[in-house]
């Protein structure tokens, strides 16, 4: 229904706390360089204005769209051109072009320092002094670094953060209480960020239809007892929610997400038997819980899919006269029978099925032609299954760090032109798939591995898009979203690459490395490894292992030495010489 004042409507629906949080996220995602205080001031102004509209919907400007109101606020920021360059040009446009322009200027890799967590005591002090400001800082810092973070989900993580601080700041040993809990939230939030970015990429590059297909497959796996109409309704609603969030319409997105959660909880009988525990929770926890609820038990008595989609003589008639419903039903039926497949794989199979019908239904004897389609799925299914087995075996053998290194070598060979920081970030993230997925039961490994890898590779593509340097990467990134992971997996050593010259300074280290946290140490070593591969792309695994073992030994020795600086300055050049010899 239409509301006289959109801003009053959303304020009433969401309540002041969530309204303010979402406006702060929106501003932080659009203008990523502004300070917290600048954004907090704008948020307060918008909130005060919203309250005047709640009091009187006919008040001046209350009938304006949210994009107009928010855009006007952003464009009124002083020194916009000095700080944001051409983003300021957006302000010369009218809505909806102005909002589109803001969206296009979102930076997936803003040059901001890493979000450093203060030490426990300081954190607890500032949290106790002003919890609202503290949480505002959290929302601002995460949102500006992750401009596509799913806003209602970020509110959920802020709530988690709040609960952890409330609990741990009351304890004697605040540090040991906070660190593992906040690390857990951070890890989950980072995964949530890359997953959501993938959804927005799908929406931006391939439109709502592609996202809806993703949603149908995912929902059919989770709710195999829901019928096709129910799945279609949920997929349509979920598509709307994600379209809004990806489009910067965060208030509408959060409101519609709450509505969807309400609908699901009111219709559990026709959706799933597993929803009750989620539905007993308060709003943010409920929506989060529903988004990752366990799969319902598969219905008994599912007949073979072949009857309707392969053996039927009327397949081509059904396809021609009801294309979307027929293909949608195929995807639904296949997905509900295969919770053990990744969504990417299910979409590849649906695409293969569609292509087969397009070809066969134009032939003289269609049933003979499409009759083998399910057998043709086999290699498509085997490929990711083999990938999971190979990689999980490797992970179990090497552990997370060793596995990351193996991936780093592999990907540096595939795309040596890509910047070392990007390769290291990608390899570290890809390597986490082992810890995340390889410990799961067999039937959960494939969906976990492939859908996670796809999300990470999407980030690789986004970063590469900014400064394209590798034809290999461009080729894989310009194809369809579901084909990316197989495309990257199939890449081999880039034969066109001219090896980098050996620069001694790249492999020169100083004693400051000794005091770095373990994670930073690993990154330094992995940076060196990537550079080695760029110097010798065809180095064997043995050669690289020799060099890296030598390197690790060198660090260990010098970091234990009484005079670290002398050790680094004398042993360092020797290490460089040995490395060159080992790779000669």
């Amino acid at each position: 229904e239409a509301h006289k004042s959109e801003i009053a409507h959303r304020y009433n629906d969401l309540g002041e706390q969530h309204f303010k949080g979402l406006v702060l996220i929106a501003f932080s995602q659009y203008l990523q360089k502004c300070s917290y205080d600048e954004h907090a001031k704008l948020v307060q102004e918008v909130t005060d204005f919203a309250k005047t509209c709640v009091a009187d919907e006919s008040a001046a400007n209350c009938d304006k769209s949210l994009h107009t109101l928010f855009g006007d606020k952003l464009c009124a920021i002083p020194n916009l051109r000095e700080n944001y360059g051409e983003l300021a040009d957006c302000c010369t446009k009218q809505e909806p072009e102005r909002n589109e322009c803001f969206l296009q200027h979102k930076d997936d890799n803003p040059s901001l320092p890493p979000f450093e967590r203060p030490e426990a005591e300081a954190m607890c002090t500032s949290f106790k002094e002003n919890p609202t400001t503290f949480m505002g800082h959290y929302l601002h810092e995460v949102a500006r670094r992750h401009p596509y973070f799913y806003a209602p989900e970020l509110l959920y993580y802020a709530e988690q953060y709040n609960e952890i601080l409330t609990q741990c700041c009351a304890e004697a040993d605040k540090e040991s209480c906070l660190t593992p809990k906040l690390d857990g939230v951070k890890e989950k939030a980072l995964v949530s960020s890359v997953r959501q970015r993938m959804k927005c990429s799908s929406m931006q590059k391939f439109g709502e239809r592609a996202f809806k297909a993703w949603a149908v497959a995912r929902l059919s796996q989770t709710f195999p007892n829901a019928d096709f109409a129910e799945i279609t309704k949920l997929a349509t609603d979920l598509t709307k929610v994600n379209k809004e969030c990806c489009h910067g319409d965060l208030l509408e997105c959060a409101d519609d997400r709450a509505e969807l959660a309400k609908y699901m909880c009111e219709n559990q009988a026709t959706i799933s038997s597993k929803l009750q525990t989620c539905c007993d929770k308060p709003l943010l926890k409920k929506a989060h819980c529903l988004s990752e609820v366990e799969h319902d038990t598969m219905p008994a008595d599912l007949p073979a899919i072949a009857a309707d989609f392969v053996e039927d003589q009327e397949v081509c008639k059904n396809y021609a006269e009801a294309k979307d419903v027929f293909l949608g039903t195929f995807l639904y039926e296949y997905s509900r029978r295969h919770p053990d497949y990744s969504v990417s794989l299910l979409l590849r199979l649906a695409k293969k099925y569609e292509a087969t019908l397009e070809k066969c239904c134009a032939e003289a004897n269609p049933p003979a032609c499409y009759g083998t389609v399910l057998a043709e799925f086999q290699p498509l299914v085997e490929e990711p299954k083999n990938l999971v087995k190979t990689n999980c075996d490797l992970y179990e053998k090497l552990g997370e760090y060793g596995f990351q290194n193996a991936i780093l070598v592999r990907y540096t060979q595939k795309a040596p032109q890509v910047s070392t920081p990007t390769l290291v970030e990608a390899a570290r993230n890809l390597g986490r798939v082992g810890t995340k997925c390889c410990t799961l039961p067999e039937d959960q490994r494939l969906p976990c591995v492939e859908d996670y890898l796809s999300a990470i590779l999407n980030r690789v593509c986004l970063l590469h898009e900014k400064t394209p340097v590798s034809e290999h990467v461009t080729k894989c990134c310009s194809g369809s979203l579901v084909e990316r992971r197989p495309c990257f997996s199939a890449l081999t050593v880039d034969e066109t690459y001219v090896p980098k010259e050996f620069k001694a300074e790249t492999f020169t280290f100083h004693s400051d490395i000794c005091t770095l946290p373990e994670k930073e140490k690993q990154i330094k070593k992995q940076t060196a490894l990537a550079e080695l591969v760029k110097h010798k792309p065809k180095a064997t695994a043995e050669q690289l292992k020799t060099v890296m073992d030598d390197f690790a030994q060198f660090l260990d020795t010098c970091c234990k030495a009484a005079d670290k600086d002398t050790c680094f300055s004398t042993e360092g050049p020797n290490l460089v010489t040995r490395c060159k010899d080992a790779l000669a």
């Epitope: 019928d227 096709f228 109409a229 129910e230 009988a269 026709t270 008595d301 599912l302 007949p303 073979a304 072949a306 009857a307 309707d308 989609f309 053996e311 039927d312 003589q313 009327e314 008639k317 059904n318 006269e321 009801a322 419903v325 027929f326 039903t329 639904y332 039926e333």
Partner: antibody, heavy 120, light 108 residues
Framework: EVQLVESGGGLVQPGGSLRLSCAAS????????MNWVRQAPGKGLEWIGH???????YYATWAKGRFTISRDNSKNTVYLQMNSLRAEDTAVYFC??????????????WGQGTLVTVSS | FELTQSPSSLSASVGDRVTITCQAS??????LAWYQQKPGQPPKLLIY???DLTSGVPSRFSGSGSGTDFTLTISSLQPEDFATYYC??????????FGGGTKLTVLG
């Protein structure tokens, strides 16, 4: 509760018409191929036709022309329009749900049936 | 296609092993179902895809076959099993066919 309820049966004269309804509850009828099957007194089951999730109707050869299947998703109801009725159309008419959107079988869910008697 | 079910009637005793066959005039792969019907009731699905037992149906019922020849077996007849049995071939959108039925009655 998931169920199908037929209605609209009764006594009709030869040459007359009748529209049977099958109301679904507990599930969305638009997701399934909905079939009509009949059974003459003391005889076997005879498939009439179905309407699938793509709104395409198919009929047994003998039923084409005289029988029409349609549905109203907003009412969650499927219909069987029967014209030029003959004495041999006297039977219990069942509606049955296909296993999926494009399935003619198997039928796990049936209505209780509605009796149509064609007689002068 | 047509389905020929045999026998059309059959008398047996409680505890007997009973077999009903269904023959299709052309191959229908495994797309065959078996139903049980009692007077005044709609049919009840027992077996689908030739050999898959519907949930809730006792394991004494079993189905076999593929292509053109199919069998329903009741390993040890119980009093509640006396009814009429139908096979159904569901080979495609425009063709689903029922067999003529087999009436199973108590011997003597």
């Amino acid at each position: 509760e998931v169920q199908l309820v037929e209605s609209g049966g009764g006594l009709v004269q030869p040459g007359g018409s009748l529209r049977l309804s099958c109301a679904a509850s507990g599930f969305s009828l638009s997701s399934y191929a909905m079939n009509w099957v009949r059974q003459a007194p003391g005889k076997g089951l005879e498939w009439i036709g179905h309407i699938n999730a793509g709104d395409i109707a198919y009929y047994a050869t003998w039923a084409k022309g005289r029988f029409t299947i349609s549905r109203d998703n907003s009412k969650n109801t499927v219909y069987l329009q029967m014209n030029s009725l003959r004495a041999e159309d006297t039977a219990v008419y069942f509606c049955a749900r296909g296993a999926g959107g494009f399935s003619t079988g198997p039928f796990k869910l049936w209505g209780q049936g509605t009796l149509v008697t064609v007689s002068s | 296609f047509e389905l020929t079910q045999s026998p059309s009637s059959l008398s047996a005793s409680v505890g007997d092993r009973v077999t009903i066959t269904c023959q299709a005039s052309e191959s229908i792969n495994s797309r065959l179902a078996w139903y049980q019907q009692k007077p005044g009731q709609p049919p009840k699905l027992l077996i689908y895809d030739a050999s898959d037992l519907t949930s809730g149906v006792p394991s004494r019922f079993s189905g076999s076959g593929s292509g053109t020849d199919f069998t329903l077996t009741i390993s040890s007849l119980q009093p509640e099993d006396f009814a009429t049995y139908y096979c159904q071939g569901y080979g495609g959108s425009s063709t689903t066919t029922f067999g003529g039925g087999t009436k199973l009655t108590v011997l003597g």
